[in-house]
Interface confidence: low
């Protein structure tokens, strides 16, 4: 089938002891090969500081996955979720202020 770019959605969990969990979800993409990783100051975090979900079919002939990491509250501006899929790539910020999610569709 033709390439379907992912919808990327970044969310923050509740604050716990000065830390927050940030999760980057990619959904509705095809084919299933995708790179999804957290970066700090433009540098990919090491694998042992990130948690990945499996790349799973979402029931519409497309796929979904996620990656999460814990960061210190107040350091959100340093982190971006990096996505690469079928030649497209992009970076997605941690939402600032009271907004706790951020959507972006790659074309």
């Amino acid at each position: 089938g033709s390439t379907v770019p992912p919808m990327v959605n970044v969310t923050c969990s509740e604050v716990s002891e000065g830390n927050i969990t940030v999760t980057c979800r990619a959904s509705s993409f095809y084919p299933r090969n995708i790179t999804l990783t957290w970066r700090q100051d433009g540098v990919s975090l090491s694998h042992n500081t990130q948690q990945w979900g499996d790349v799973l079919p979402d029931g519409n002939g497309t796929y979904q996955t996620w990656v999460a990491t814990r960061i210190r509250q107040g350091e959100e501006q340093r982190f971006t979720c990096y996505m690469e899929h079928s030649g497209n790539h992009g970076t997605h910020p941690v939402p600032s202020g009271n907004s706790h999610h951020h959507h972006h569709h790659h074309h």
């Epitope: 100051d41 433009g42 540098v43 350091e75 340093r78 971006t80 970076t91 910020p93």
Partner: antibody
Framework: EVQLVESGGGLVKPGGSLKLSCAAS????????MYWVRQTPEKRLEWVAT????????YYSDSVRGRFTISRDNAENTLYLQMSSLKSEDTAMYYC??????????????WGQGTSVTVSS | DIQMNQSPSSLSASLGDTITITCHAS??????LSWYQQKPGNIPKLLIY???HLHTGVPSRFSGRGSGTGFTLTISSLQPEDIATYYC?????????FGSGTKVEIK
Amino acid sequence: EVQLVESGGGLVKPGGSLKLSCAASGFTFSDYYMYWVRQTPEKRLEWVATISDGITYTYYSDSVRGRFTISRDNAENTLYLQMSSLKSEDTAMYYCSKGGGSTARGALDFWGQGTSVTVSS
Amino acid sequence: DIQMNQSPSSLSASLGDTITITCHASQNIHVWLSWYQQKPGNIPKLLIYGASHLHTGVPSRFSGRGSGTGFTLTISSLQPEDIATYYCLQGQSYPLTFGSGTKVEIK
């Protein structure tokens, strides 16, 4: 070869404004965090500001926050520092530098030659 | 803010000597420390990143060690071209902070 060329420095009166530019070449500019660092006449190095690769995020030192604005034009491969309400303590050599990318966070792997800013009446 | 206490402020050594410069962080910065060399009349240049990794083109007589709060830069077999001021920089959290510098001279 990575090249960073700053311009826009000069002599300005207290309270005045300047806009510094940094023309980048030799690397994929839009993929890297960029930084302004200054060196005081006493040779102390001070981090000034950072901008993320995608223009999304900016960070400032307490001493310049609210007076300086870092920005970038990824189409033109250029980094900027708009400086206003300048004070004598802003007198320094201003360096544009490139984030380390695949090396380590907070490492500045290439620096420009610098542009001198003097704030004096 | 994280303070970086660099010592000594200056040192004088003979050609061929091994010298060590120390940076102490006021809190844990893991390995997010880099070292820079600035020769007289020149710009700073990256020597070491991630506490111990040699930047491209830097001679192997330079080495970095440490993690947490204590870090060292060692120059083995000091050469005339090593006359410079050396600075450390922490990249763990904003504001990024430099050490005050160590001026290295030849006896």
